[in-house]
C-alpha cells in the first residue's frame, strides 16, 4: 500500500514535543534525528489515517506508533493495531472507528524500536481534522422558468458540514463559487436558457462541529441543459447513471431520478 | 494587449524539481482560473493542471497527480507550478492558459527537459 | 475518461477549399468542446467555444456545428494562413479535460 502524505492545514493547536537524548556536537548519533512528523486525518469520523514519510529516514525503518487520549478515560497507552506500509516499511497507522474521540485530546507518539529514545510526540484535535466523504445524490429542480434549486446528501455528517458549490455553463471559461451553510441545498436565481450548467459541490467538518480546514473531494458533477427535453429527455445525466425525466412527466418539475426509479417510473 | 510570459523550466535529472512560473498581464487575472498544458515534443496537447479564481481548489491529470502542485499569487498576476518526482514522459514544453476549462489565451511555453 | 477522436489525422487542400474536420467524442459531451489552431512554434488560439460560438476576433470563415458525440469545424473558404494543426477539447466531465489527437492541414 503506497500511502498519499497529506498536509495538516488544519491543526494550528497541534504541539510537537522531540524527546531526544543530548550529544556531545563532535558526534552524530541516530537518536538526534528527528522524526518525521506524524499527519493524521479522520475519515468521516468512519476511521482515521496517522501517516508519516518514512522515506525520511536515512535508512529503511519501521517505525512504531503508540497513542492516547489525554486527561480522560482512555489515557491508556494503546499500540497501533494496523499498520499501513510503503514499499514494505511501516509509514502509517489505521484506527477504526471505536478508536477514535473526536472531542478529546489525542496524543500519537512515533518511535525507533531500534533506538527506543529516538521518540516524538504530537497532541492533535481530532474535530480539526475531519474530511467528509463527497456529497452524493445530486439533484435539480426547476423551481420557476428561469431558477433551479440544486440538492445533495451527505452520509452521515450533515449538520456538521459547510458546503462549497461551483457551477459554469459550457460557454464559461471558469467556475463561480458560492459557499452554502449546514442546509445542503442551492438556489441558482436567473438561468439562461440557452446555455448548459455544470454543478459540483464539495463539503467540509466546519464550522459548528469542529473547525478542519481540509475539503472533501468534490462531488460527481451534474448537469442541465437548454434542449434536453427537445433532443432526447434523458440527456445530461450524472455520472452515476441519473438521469432527466421530462416536465410532463413530473407535473411541471423537472427531476434527475436514479436508473432504478426511472424503471419503476415507466411501468406505474 | 493579452500577455502570459513562462519562466523557469531547463534541463533536470528523472526524480529532479522545478518551479514553472506564468506572469499574467492584459486581463484581470483574479476574474480567471488558469490552467497548465504541456504539449510534448512532435505530440499533441495535453492538460495537466487547472486553479480556480482564488486558489481555493485545484484539479490534476492522473499522471502528475502527487507530484505536481499548482498554485497562484493574485496580488502578482502570477500563477505557478511545482514539479517534482520529474520523470523523462514529463518531457515537454509546458504552456499556461487563461481559464479552467476553456482556454481563451496562452503563452508561448517554457521547455522542461527531464534526462539523464 | 472521456476519449476524444478527430479525423482525418491529416489533410491536404488549397487556398479556396472548403475544409471540414470532425471530431467525436467518446460519450455525449452535450456542447461542452472547443476548438484550437496552432501554428508550429505557436501558441494554440482558441477558435470555437461551446460547440458553435465564434471567439472575439476570429474570422467568420470559421464556424463549428454538432452536440452530443459529433461535432464538426468547418472552414469555409480556406486562406493561407489557416493551415495549421487544429485541435478540439472537451470539458464536460473535467477532470481530466482532454483533447483530439490534432489534424494536420497541410497545403496541397
Known amino acids: 500500500l503506497n500511502t498519499t502524505i497529506l498536509t495538516p492545514n488544519g491543526n494550528e493547536d497541534a504541539t510537537t514535543d522531540f524527546f531526544l537524548t543530548s550529544m556531545p556536537t563532535d558526534s552524530l548519533s541516530v537518536s538526534t534525528l528527528p522524526l518525521p512528523e506524524v499527519q493524521c486525518f479522520v475519515f468521516n469520523v468512519e476511521y482515521m489515517n496517522c501517516t508519516w514519510n518514512s522515506s525520511s529516514e536515512p535508512q529503511p525503518t519501521n517505525l512504531t506508533l503508540h497513542y492516547w487520549y489525554k486527561n480522560s478515560d482512555n489515557d491508556k497507552v494503546q499500540k497501533c493495531s494496523h499498520y499501513l506500509f510503503s514499499e514494505e516499511i511501516t509509514s502509517g497507522c489505521q484506527l477504526q472507528k471505536k478508536e477514535i474521540h473526536l472531542y478529546q485530546t489525542f496524543v500519537v507518539q512515533l518511535q525507533d524500536p531500534r533506538e527506543p529514545r529516538r521518540q516524538a510526540t504530537q497532541m492533535l484535535k481530532l474535530q480539526n481534522l475531519v474530511i467528509p466523504w463527497a456529497p452524493e445524490n445530486l439533484t435539480l429542480r426547476k423551481l420557476s422558468e428561469s431558477q433551479l434549486e440544486l440538492n445533495w446528501n451527505n452520509r452521515f455528517l450533515n449538520h456538521c458540514l459547510e458546503h462549497l458549490v461551483q457551477y459554469r455553463t459550457d460557454w464559461d471559461h471558469s467556475w463561480t463559487e458560492q459557499s452554502v451553510d449546514y442546509r445542503h441545498k442551492f438556489s441558482l436565481p436567473s438561468v439562461d436558457g440557452q446555455k448548459r450548467y455544470t454543478f459540483r459541490v464539495r463539503s467540509r467538518f466546519n464550522p459548528l462541529c469542529g473547525s478542519a480546514q481540509h475539503w472533501s473531494e468534490w462531488s460527481h458533477p451534474i448537469h442541465w441543459g437548454s434542449n434536453s427535453s427537445k433532443e432526447n429527455p434523458f440527456l445530461f445525466a450524472l455520472e452515476a447513471e441519473q438521469k432527466l425525466i421530462s416536465e410532463e412527466d413530473l407535473g411541471g418539475e423537472q427531476k434527475l431520478i436514479s436508473e432504478e426509479d426511472l424503471h419503476h417510473h415507466h411501468h406505474h | 494587449e493579452v500577455q502570459l510570459v513562462e519562466s523557469g523550466g531547463g534541463v533536470v535529472r528523472p526524480g529532479g524539481s522545478l518551479r514553472l512560473s506564468c506572469a499574467a498581464s492584459?486581463?484581470?487575472?483574479?476574474?480567471?482560473?488558469m490552467s497548465w498544458v504541456r504539449q510534448a515534443p512532435g505530440k499533441g496537447l495535453e492538460w495537466i493542471s487547472s486553479i480556480n479564481r482564488n486558489g481555493g481548489s485545484a484539479d490534476y491529470a492522473d499522471s502528475v497527480k502527487g507530484r505536481f502542485t499548482i498554485s497562484r499569487d493574485n496580488a502578482k498576476n502570477s500563477l505557478f507550478l511545482q514539479m517534482s518526482s520529474l520523470r523523462a514522459e514529463d518531457t515537454a514544453l509546458y504552456h499556461c492558459?487563461?481559464?479552467?476549462?476553456?482556454?481563451?489565451?496562452w503563452g508561448q511555453g517554457t521547455l522542461v527537459t527531464v534526462s539523464s | 475518461d472521456i476519449q476524444m477522436t478527430q479525423s482525418p489525422s491529416s489533410l491536404s487542400a488549397s487556398v479556396g477549399d472548403r475544409v471540414t474536420i470532425t471530431c467525436r467524442a467518446s460519450?455525449?459531451?452535450?456542447?461542452?468542446l472547443n476548438w484550437y489552431q496552432q501554428k508550429p512554434g505557436k501558441a494554440p488560439k482558441l477558435l470555437i467555444y461551446a460547440a458553435s460560438s465564434l471567439q472575439s476576433g476570429v474570422p467568420s470563415r470559421f464556424s463549428g456545428s454538432g452536440s452530443g458525440t459529433d461535432f464538426t469545424l468547418t472552414i469555409s473558404s480556406l486562406q493561407p494562413e489557416d493551415f495549421a494543426t487544429y485541435y478540439c477539447q472537451q470539458s464536460y466531465s473535467t477532470p481530466p479535460i482532454t483533447f483530439g489527437q490534432g489534424t494536420r492541414l497541410e497545403i496541397k
Open positions: 492584459g486581463f484581470t487575472f483574479d476574474d480567471y482560473g
Open positions: 460519450q455525449s459531451i452535450s456542447s461542452y
Open positions: 492558459a487563461s481559464g479552467e476549462f476553456r482556454f481563451d489565451y
